[in-house]
Amino acid sequence: QGWQAFKNDATEIIPELGEYPEPPPELENNKTMNRAENGGRPPHHPFETKDVSEYSCRELHFTRYVTDGQCRSAKPVTELVCSGQCGPARLLPNAIGRGKWWRPSGPDFRCIPDRYRAQRVQLLCPGGAAPRARKVRLVASCKCKRLTRFHNQSELKDFGPEAARPQKGRKPRPRARGAKANQAELENAY
């Protein structure tokens, strides 16, 4: 239910050179009328390195139907999963089998959602019930972010398609976005 992936594309995000170690204060980012600059959210330049190609943050694309209770979207939506450790790119791809996982001795950079977007979804329900219109929150892009010991443990998980579809009537947990209803299938996709 929900995770019928038609397509699975991976895109590597190579961070641009930027300030270290945190993004600068984006004071009063003015999201102007009818202008979608950077999707309306400020860009992040999380860290600098002598060789930018050494870092990798992967965007995995999944196309699937979304569900809400017994109702299912009339059309599939394409979602992003942010994956990867933001470690040296040369060690990340296909490295699991060889056990070559890069572990930084310093700050832990993780590949997490940067910006979000909404997409309209029409849900078709069984039993002749009226269709429903909803807007789903989808990850628009991923970024490498430096995590500190102050970050919530939930942030250390890989971020799936919104990491979570909160179950009906249950409040989503901050940041982690609620119960990971399809997490097992998500992890298999990795």
Partner: antibody
Framework: EVQLVQSGAEVKKPGASVKVSCKVS????????MHWVRQAPGKGLEWMGG????????IYAQKFQGRVTMTEDTSTDTAYMELSSLRSEDTAVYYC??????????????WGQGTLVTVSS | QAVVTQEPSLTVSPGGTVTLTCGSS?????????PYWFQQKPGQAPRTLIS???DKHSWTPARFSGSLLGGKAALTLSGAQPEDEAEYYC?????????FGGGTKLTVL
């Protein structure tokens, strides 16, 4: 759970500007869709503008275009609403309101406590 | 800009049923207007009762329900309680633009 805390009451003279802040906790501001709504004394709710995540832009109500500016400081998770060329009819309680996070967008789920702006000469 | 209309005031007896409606100057209200309903009591910020036509929230009493009725959005209160006396606002989306209705003052008498 999202929580919104707004700045304190303001008294302004006609023609001046006011800037109201709204501090977000529980989520990061960049995850949420922030809107601003005002309510004049004894009147109804009036939408001023907000972030449309579908178009990735801030949209202002026609009535306020050119006079209102909504900005965000993502480093402090604080949203701002600045209204210029104030007149007496701008006297109102100004609310920030945001969605609840989560997979389905549910807008206007969490509201600030309101900021009373009084415009008087 | 579209105008969203609501009944200025309605009265319901305790335990009774009442339906508040929300119309659009542009024509029929559909699910694509994502109707929202809010309750506001004096001196308080509004709180959302219904999102997206019919979606209740964890804090929404079961006696409230949202629907589309006769080309309008509707909020039905079944089994009114004294604490339901309040101002009720609807909201419609027109693309990225949002318009509130003028509000309905509901009296439980």
């Amino acid at each position: 759970e999202v929580q919104l805390v707004q700045s304190g009451a303001e008294v302004k003279k006609p023609g001046a500007s006011v800037k109201v802040s709204c501090k977000v906790s529980g989520y990061t501001l960049s995850e949420l869709s922030m809107h601003w709504v005002r309510q004049a004394p004894g009147k109804g709710l009036e939408w001023m503008g907000g972030f449309d995540p579908e178009g990735g832009e801030t949209i202002y109500a026609q009535k306020f275009q050119g006079r209102v500016t909504m900005t965000e400081d993502t480093s402090t998770d604080t949203a701002y609403m600045e209204l210029s060329s104030l007149r007496s009819e701008d006297t109102a309680v100004y609310y920030c309101a945001t969605d609840a996070g989560g997979y389905w967008y549910k807008f206007f789920q969490h509201w600030g406590q309101g900021t009373l702006v009084t415009v008087s000469s | 800009q579209a105008v969203v209309t609501q009944e200025p005031s309605l009265t319901v007896s305790p335990g009774g049923t009442v339906t508040l409606t929300c119309g659009s100057s542009t024509g029929t209200v559909t699910i694509d207007h994502y109707p929202y309903w809010f309750q506001q009591k004096p001196g308080q910020a509004p709180r959302t009762l219904i999102s997206d036509t019919d979606d209740k929230h964890s804090w929404t009493p079961a006696r409230f329900s949202g629907s589309l009725l006769g080309g309008k959005a509707a909020l039905t209160l079944s089994g009114a309680q004294p604490e339901d006396e309040a101002e009720y606002y609807c909201l419609l989306f027109y693309g990225g633009t949002v318009v509130f209705g003028g509000g309905t003052k509901l009296t439980v008498l």
